[in-house]
Interface confidence: low
C-alpha cells in the first residue's frame, strides 16, 4: 500500500542512519550576542544521518521519493533527515525597554525523520 | 535577530536551488499497478535542488542550521529541500469489496523550502 | 530505562593516571552529552567538563585543562575520563552525568566511581 | 565564573515544616538554574530545571522559582525522606558550576 511501515533499523551500520544529535553553539557561533542575553550556550539537536530505503520514512510522499530516487538517482534526489518535531527554547533577549524571555517554539529538533 | 529573512533568490543560477520540479512515474515505478487501478501515471512534484546560506529557510532551526553548517561542515550538514506543503491526490485502488476512491494528502508535494 | 554504569574503585598513587568508564544504556547515546563531577569526600560538587557524544566537542574546566581528557566510544556507548597526574586532592568520588539538554541539568547520573590517591 | 552562593549551609527542621533555600548567582542567569538533591553515598538527584519546572517523578512539594540571579527552593512540607544536602547548578554559561550546597537536618 502507499502506507508501507517506514523502516527502523540502520543498514548501514550505527550512528550513520537519520537520527538526532547534539551540536554545541555558541551566541557568537549564531551570530547572536549582540542581542541574545542567555544562554551563553546552547545545546542544539540537529538532525544527521543518511536516508536509505524507506528509512524513517516521513509520509507517502517520501517513500515515493525513496523508490524513485532508486530509479532515477540523477533526477530524484534520496529523501534526507529533516526534524520532525521540535522541543521549546527559552531565550532572554535585549529589547528597546530592557530584557525580555521569548519562547522559540521551532529552534531545536526533537526527533527526526526522512522527507 | 532569530527570524533573519530566508533569501529567495539562487546564488547559485537558475534552477539550481531548492524548487517544486515534476517527475513523471507510471504505477509499475511505483511498485502500485497491482492495487492502484486509475490513474495508470502520475505527475508527481517534488522538492529537488541545492540549499545555499540561508535560502528559503523553513525556521529558525534551518537557518541555525545554515550558520553552523558554514562554521562546522564535516559536523553539522547543510540544509535540505523538502516540502512545506502537500497537494491533495485521489487515487483508484481495488478493494475486497471492488474498487473505492481514495484521497492522499501527503503524496505530491506543492512547496518547498529548506529544512 | 536510562542508566550510567560507571567502572570501579581505583587506588591510585601519587603521579599516576587514571581512567574512569561510564557505559550508558536505555537511550541514543550520542544524542547527549555526557558531563564528568567530582565530589571530594564531605566536600560540595565539581563540575570537571563536558563532552557530546556525537561530535566529541570538549569544555573543561580551568584548573583541570591540560590534566583531564574526556573520550567517548559510540560503539558501545561509552565514555571515559582520564585525569593525569594525579595529587591527593583529587581523591574524590567521580560521577558521569547524562547532559547538558537544552538547560544544561543533569537528569541521570552514574552510581559514581571512588578514587583515592595516597602513597 | 559565575559563582551560586546558597544560604543557609545548614538548616534544622521538623516533618511537616516548610523550608526555603536560596541560592544567589552573581550575575543574571535566568532561567538556566537546576537545583538537585543528594543523601549520603548516592548520586544527586535532580529535582527542578529551567528554575522552575519540576522534573518528572518529583513529589510536587518540591518547587522552584526565582530569576534574574535570586532563586528558591522551597518543600512546602517536609517528609522524612527530605532530609538530605540540596545544591543549586547554574547552566548559563561554562564553566558550569554548582552552589556549596545546604544540608537539611532533623530537628
Known amino acids: 500500500s502507499a502506507h508501507a511501515h517506514p523502516r527502523d533499523s540502520c543498514p548501514l551500520g550505527p550512528g550513520r542512519c537519520c537520527h538526532l544529535e547534539t551540536v554545541q553553539a555558541t551566541l557568537e557561533d549564531l551570530g547572536w550576542s549582540d542581542w541574545v542575553l542567555s544562554p551563553r550556550q546552547l545545546q542544539l539537536s540537529m538532525c544527521v544521518g543518511e536516508c536509505p530505503h524507506l528509512y524513517r520514512s516521513a509520509n507517502t510522499h517520501a517513500q515515493i521519493k525513496a523508490r524513485l530516487h532508486g530509479l532515477q538517482p540523477d533526477k530524484v534526489p534520496a529523501p534526507c533527515c529533516v526534524p520532525s518535531s521540535y522541543t521549546p527554547v527559552v531565550l532572554m533577549h535585549r529589547t528597546d525597554s530592557g530584557v525580555s524571555l521569548q519562547t522559540y517554539d521551532d529552534l531545536v529538533a526533537r526527533g527526526c525523520h526522512c522527507a | 535577530s532569530a527570524h533573519a529573512h530566508p533569501r529567495d533568490s539562487c546564488p547559485l543560477g537558475p534552477g539550481r536551488c531548492c524548487h517544486l520540479e515534476t517527475v513523471q512515474a507510471t504505477l509499475e515505478d511505483l511498485g502500485w499497478s497491482d492495487w492502484v487501478l486509475s490513474p495508470r501515471q502520475l505527475q508527481l512534484s517534488m522538492c529537488v535542488g541545492e540549499c545555499p546560506h540561508l535560502y528559503r529557510s523553513a525556521n529558525t532551526h534551518a537557518q541555525i542550521k545554515a550558520r553552523l553548517h558554514g562554521l562546522q561542515p564535516d559536523k553539522v550538514p547543510a540544509p535540505c529541500c523538502v516540502p512545506s506543503s502537500y497537494t491533495p491526490v485521489v487515487l483508484m485502488h481495488r478493494t475486497d469489496s471492488g474498487v473505492s476512491l481514495q484521497t492522499y494528502d501527503d503524496l505530491v508535494a506543492r512547496g518547498c523550502h529548506c529544512a | 530505562q536510562v542508566q550510567l554504569v560507571q567502572s570501579g574503585a581505583e587506588v591510585k598513587k601519587p603521579g599516576a593516571s587514571v581512567k574512569v568508564s561510564c557505559k550508558a544504556s536505555?537511550?541514543?547515546?550520542?544524542?547527549?552529552?555526557i558531563n564528568w563531577v567530582r565530589q571530594a569526600p564531605g566536600q560540595g560538587l565539581e563540575w570537571m567538563g563536558w563532552i557530546t557524544a556525537y561530535s566529541g566537542d570538549t569544555n573543561y574546566a580551568q584548573k583541570l585543562q591540560g590534566r583531564v581528557t574526556m573520550t567517548t566510544d559510540t560503539s558501545t556507548s561509552t565514555a571515559y575520563m582520564e585525569l593525569r597526574s594525579l595529587r591527593s586532592d583529587d581523591t574524590a568520588v567521580y560521577y558521569c552525568?547524562?547532559?547538558?539538554?537544552?538547560?544544561?541539568?543533569?537528569?541521570?547520573w552514574g552510581q559514581g566511581t571512588m578514587v583515592t590517591v595516597s602513597s | 565564573d559565575i559563582q551560586l552562593t546558597q544560604s543557609p549551609s545548614s538548616v534544622s527542621a521538623s516533618v511537616g515544616d516548610r523550608v526555603t533555600i536560596t541560592c544567589r548567582a552573581s550575575?543574571?542567569?535566568?532561567?538556566?538554574l537546576a537545583w538537585y538533591q543528594q543523601k549520603p553515598g548516592k548520586a544527586p538527584k535532580l529535582l527542578i530545571y529551567a528554575a522552575s519546572s519540576l522534573q518528572s517523578g518529583v513529589p510536587s512539594r518540591f518547587s522552584g522559582s526565582g530569576s534574574g540571579t535570586d532563586f528558591t527552593l522551597t518543600i512546602s512540607s517536609l517528609q522524612p525522606e527530605d532530609f538530605a544536602t540540596y545544591y543549586c547548578?547554574?547552566?548559563?554559561?561554562?564553566?558550569?558550576?554548582f552552589g556549596g550546597g545546604t544540608k537539611v537536618e532533623i530537628k
Open positions: 550575575q543574571g542567569i535566568s532561567p538556566w
Open positions: 552525568a547524562r547532559g547538558p539538554g537544552q538547560y544544561a541539568d543533569v537528569d541521570v
Open positions: 547548578q547554574q547552566a548559563n554559561s561554562f564553566p558550569i558550576t
Open positions: 536505555g537511550y541514543t547515546f550520542t544524542s547527549y552529552g
